[in-house]
């Protein structure tokens, strides 16, 4: 895990002091990850609380940075940092160790194999005649007389320690603050030296420039300033993390930062530092963090104290002892990433002389099994041998080597190989909006397996059908749109996803039904008559140029614009060519039209057609009743209607043939205010039905209807005429 | 072979009118509804009226309403646009389009259209 | 009444380009909408109709696609004979409006 805590130890001042914790991990921060932690752990060096509450101040998710300390206790102790989710969570510690205290330790980290002897030294900073108590993460361990100090520092020897032998080590003198202890960490491998793995049977990469080797998974933990599975390349000056991807706050640099890594490499100056407060350069001939390095270069390199030996033309190696006569392996990918069940083919390129040939190169797997070159290529500088690799297991994950050897000596390259299994979804795609002919699908789905995703495949074809699968590569982050489809249609729609690389392609995910809309109902009518059949109550006709192939029925919209008022009316028949429509408003000028509809989706409206519907009559007259006066007469009488809605302006009588199949007639009284009327003109002794109404501005509702019959036998009449006067 | 040919076009002083026709051949004239857009010189198409195939239906473009009426005579194939109260800004080419009868929704078959120009 | 909005008004393009026009109505209009091509001194002439259906005798280049409000008209590659003002125009409901035009030309 790509994880460092770092201290500026040139910040002497507590209230400015602070320590930052920086994850350098591939997609650190995604928000499924549990979020940096970096706090003060009081589990073992417990000092006085705080003046005040330390505060995290978050720089993005992957870095965090504590402060709010205000005196100088308030630095002692222990620090640690946790970060990486699962399996990966990593927690870093930092000790620190108060400048003024009695004691100080020569070195605070000590990792040690299993079965070493670790020996703790702290040097007398302010001297007290008092014993020295050792105690392992605060419980007594040991003492010593003031006088066993050997050239001013007392040591503390550990033999053959155990991994339950690490933790935090103090040397204190007898009755003093434990704020003017010397503070140590052991840290203990759980193998012997080059050795990792249960049972501790694997050997370590062989880790350089001070790298160290992980009990767990036989990784190199590099110093800062390193990079490579064997920490054999040198960061540019500044610069720390496994890609050599942080770089050193400030115009210093590095100088006066303690970094302290995961396990089991501890805390050490940058690399081209070293002492207490890793402010003191590298002394000539030295190098790496806390310049533990020795140069020792040969053949005329010259030793940089941040990279080592910087070897001239014609050499190489670490101290610059390889010529280029003996064989080299020229760049290789520290890392490759291969998918499950591929057969890649691994080319490795070696110099020398005299030349590398075929049978010289080969490539080692994790488990131990030797490969041999299938096929080499040679040109005037180098040998490329390319290495058929069989089906790969996730059991091939882990370091390679390719090997060189060839009477010129011989070199090799451990190179770390992933395998990664190709992403399958577990959900399937889910359907965002939908048409008679188009699906809007979201492929966004939630996968097995390894990212990232290079490639969505969507499958789909019409449900029970047999057909082959309609296939569409789409963008993971975009919805996408399925055009040309059948109107209302199952459709099942499937998604494979792919990750980068040969052999990338995942399994299909399960299939999700999505159903499109009915079709659309194409056909525009024509409306082709109207009639106000009374006020409030119109019949309108119209057509359509064809049958509908799809149609449910009609929707009639009459647009009321002086109120802003729209009315619908459903006709839900398709047969249906003419509707009548009442309750309408009397006196209201309407625009109508009319559209085909099938299902939710409405067709063309036709052009609208615009009604004026008349305003309402008054109510009918009341107590209409009729008297015969002869063979030929019968006289009318009624009253006014019942609150009429404005002057009348005249009455009309029906009059009709009792039983008779011929039209009524029809007659005006001009003079409002006459309530009677004698009718002449009728045959005798014939059956007549009468009833009669207003009007206003419109026509009224008619009366009663009454009955009655003229008297004995008379003349035929022409027919009936009027006589009216006032009741 | 549909042929759609428009006459009356011409100059006309504003508050004049005019008696676009239009004559149909080689389709069922009563069949169809039919349109009418305009294009005035150097701009785009305008919607102006239409009428159904039996003549019973028409609508109008606002910014003819009441001016021009729409109207057809099936015995003769011939449509018509009565252009009244003319103004400077119905300066145009008059088209006449056949109105599809559905599901292909778009004008197919236009005339040549016919120039009508107000200016005093 | 509906509202229909094109753009860009003019482009200028390259033979062999892809070119897309694109059309937006005020409101919903389903997939009532048609394209024309005009050139110059000439009558319109319809290129897709029901928004995404190629006219019979129109080249293949020539494409529609949307529904509901935006629309597009896209021509996969362009050629000089392409050079024209282009109009879509909704069939909804009356008055039955065109688009303001786009005037197409040749780089």
């Known amino acids: 895990v790509d994880l460092t805590l770092l201290a500026n130890l040139r910040i002497t001042d507590p209230q400015r002091f602070f320590l930052t914790c920086v994850s350098g991990e591939a997609g650190a921060g995604r928000s499924s990850d549990p979020p940096l932690l970096l706090e003060k752990d009081d589990r073992i060096v417990r000092t006085f609380p705080p003046g005040q509450p330390l505060y995290l101040a978050r720089n993005g998710s992957h870095q965090v940075t504590l402060r709010g300390f205000s005196k100088p206790s308030d630095l002692v102790g222990v620090f640690s940092c946790v970060g990486g989710a699962g399996a990966r969570r990593t927690r870093v510690l930092y000790v620190h160790n108060s400048p003024g205290a009695h004691l100080f330790p020569d070195k605070v980290t000590h990792t040690v194999n299993k079965g070493d002897t670790a020996v703790l030294s702290a040097h007398v900073h302010k001297e007290k005649q008092t014993d020295v108590i050792w105690k392992n993460n605060g419980s007594y361990f040991n003492t010593l007389d003031w006088q066993e100090a050997d050239d001013g520092r007392f040591q503390l020897q550990l033999q053959n320690v155990q991994p339950p032998s690490s933790g935090i080590y103090s040397a204190t003198y007898l009755e003093a603050s434990p704020l003017g202890s010397a503070f140590f960490r052991l840290i203990v491998r759980g193998c012997g030296a080059g050795r990792w793995g249960p049972g501790c049977v694997k050997d370590c990469p062989g880790c350089l420039h001070g790298g160290v080797c992980h009990d767990h998974d036989g990784e190199c933990v590099c110093p800062p300033g390193f990079t490579g599975t064997r920490c054999e390349q040198a960061c540019r000056e500044g610069r720390f993390g496994q890609s050599c991807q942080e770089q050193c706050p400030g115009t210093a640099g590095c100088r006066g930062l303690t970094f302290c890594l995961p396990d089991p490499y501890g805390c050490s100056c940058g690399s081209g530092w070293r002492g207490s407060q890793c402010q003191e350069a590298c002394a000539p001939g030295h190098f790496g963090a806390d310049c533990r390095l020795q140069c020792q270069c040969q053949n005329g390199g010259t030793c940089d104290r941040f990279s080592g030996c910087v070897c001239p033309s014609g050499w190489h190696g670490v101290h610059c002892e390889k010529s280029d006569r003996i064989p080299q392996i020229l760049s290789m990918a520290t890392e490759v990433e291969f998918n499950i069940g591929t057969m890649p083919r691994i080319n490795c390129a070696a110099a020398g002389n005299p030349f590398p040939v075929r049978g010289s190169m080969k490539l080692r797997k994790p488990d131990g099994t030797m490969l041999l070159s299938t096929k080499v290529i040679v040109e005037p500088d180098r040998t490329t041998a390319e290495f058929e690799v069989p089906s790969l297991t996730l059991g091939d994950s882990g370091f390679w080597e390719c090997r060189v050897s060839t009477s010129g000596g011989q070199d090799s390259r451990r190179f770390k190989v992933n395998v990664k299994v190709p992403p399958v979804p577990l959900t399937a795609p889910r359907l965002l909006a939908k048409q008679s002919r188009q699906l809007v699908v979201s492929p966004l789905v939630s996968f097995s397996g390894d990212g990232p995703i290079s490639s969505v495949r969507l499958h789909y074809r019409p449900q029970d059908s047999t057909i082959a699968w309609s296939a569409i590569v789409v963008d993971p982050s975009e919805n996408v749109t399925l055009m040309n489809l059948k109107p209302k249609t199952g459709y099942n729609v499937r998604v494979q996803l792919s990750r980068p690389g040969e052999g990338g392609e995942g399994g299909w995910g399960p299939s999700a039904l999505m159903t499109t809309d009915c079709p659309e109902p194409l056909l525009q009518p024509w409306l082709e008559s109207w009639h106000v059949e009374g006020p409030d109550r119109l019949r309108v006709s119209w057509s359509l140029p064809s049958v509908p192939l799809s149609g449910d029925g009609f929707l009639l919209r009459l647009w009321d614009g002086a109120r802003g008022q729209e009315r619908r009316e459903n006709i839900s028949f398709p047969q249906a060519r003419t509707a009548l429509l009442t309750g309408l408003t009397p006196g209201t000028h309407y625009q109508l039209d009319v559209r085909l509809y099938h299902c939710t989706l409405l067709g063309p409206a036709s052009p609208p057609a615009h009604v004026h519907l008349p305003p309402s009559g008054p109510p009918a007259p009341r107590h209409l009743h009729a008297q015969a006066l002869s063979d030929s007469e019968i006289q009318l009488m009624w009253q006014h209607p019942e609150a009429p809605s404005g002057p009348i302006s005249k009455y009309i009588v029906e009059i009709q043939v009792a039983g008779g199949s011929g039209d009524p007639q029809w007659m005006d009284v001009d003079r409002p205010e006459e309530t009677s009327i004698i009718v002449r003109g009728l045959n005798a002794s014939t059956r007549y039905l009468f009833r009669v109404r207003a009007s206003v501005q419109g026509l009224g509702d008619w009366s009663n209807t009454v009955e009655e019959a003229t008297l004995g036998n008379g003349l035929q009449s022409e027919g009936p005429v009027r006589e009216s006067r006032a009741a | 072979e549909v042929q759609l040919l428009e006459s009356g076009g011409g100059l006309v002083q504003p508050g004049g009118s005019l008696r676009l026709s239009c004559a149909a051949s080689?389709?069922?004239?009563?069949?169809?509804?039919m349109v009418w857009v305009r294009q005035a010189p150097g701009k785009g198409l305008e919607w102006v009226s239409v009428i159904s195939p039996s003549g019973g239906n028409t609508g109008y473009a606002d910014s003819v309403k009441g001016r021009f009426t729409i109207s057809r005579d099936n015995s003769k194939n011939t449509l018509y646009l009565q252009v009244n109260s003319l103004r400077a800004e119905d300066t145009a080419v008059y088209y006449c389009a056949r109105a599809p009868r559905g599901y292909s929704y778009g004008y197919y078959y236009w005339g040549q259209g016919t120039l009508v120009t107000v200016s005093s | 009444d509906i509202q229909m909005t094109q753009s860009p008004s003019s482009l200028s393009a390259s033979v062999g380009d892809r070119v897309t026009i694109t059309c937006r109505a005020s409101?919903?209009?389903?997939?009532?909408l048609a394209w024309y091509q005009q050139k110059p001194g000439k009558v319109p002439k319809l290129l897709i109709y029901t928004a995404s259906t190629l006219q019979s005798g129109v080249p293949s280049r020539f494409s529609g696609s949307g529904s509901g409000t935006d629309f597009t008209l896209t021509i996969s590659s362009l050629q000089p004979e392409d050079v024209a003002t282009y109009y879509c125009?909704?069939?909804?409901?009356?008055?039955?409006?065109f688009g303001q035009g786009t005037r197409l030309e040749i780089k």
């Open positions: 409101q919903g209009i389903g997939h009532y």
């Open positions: 080689g389709f069922t004239f009563s069949m169809y509804g």
């Open positions: 125009q909704q069939f909804n409901s009356y008055p039955h409006t």
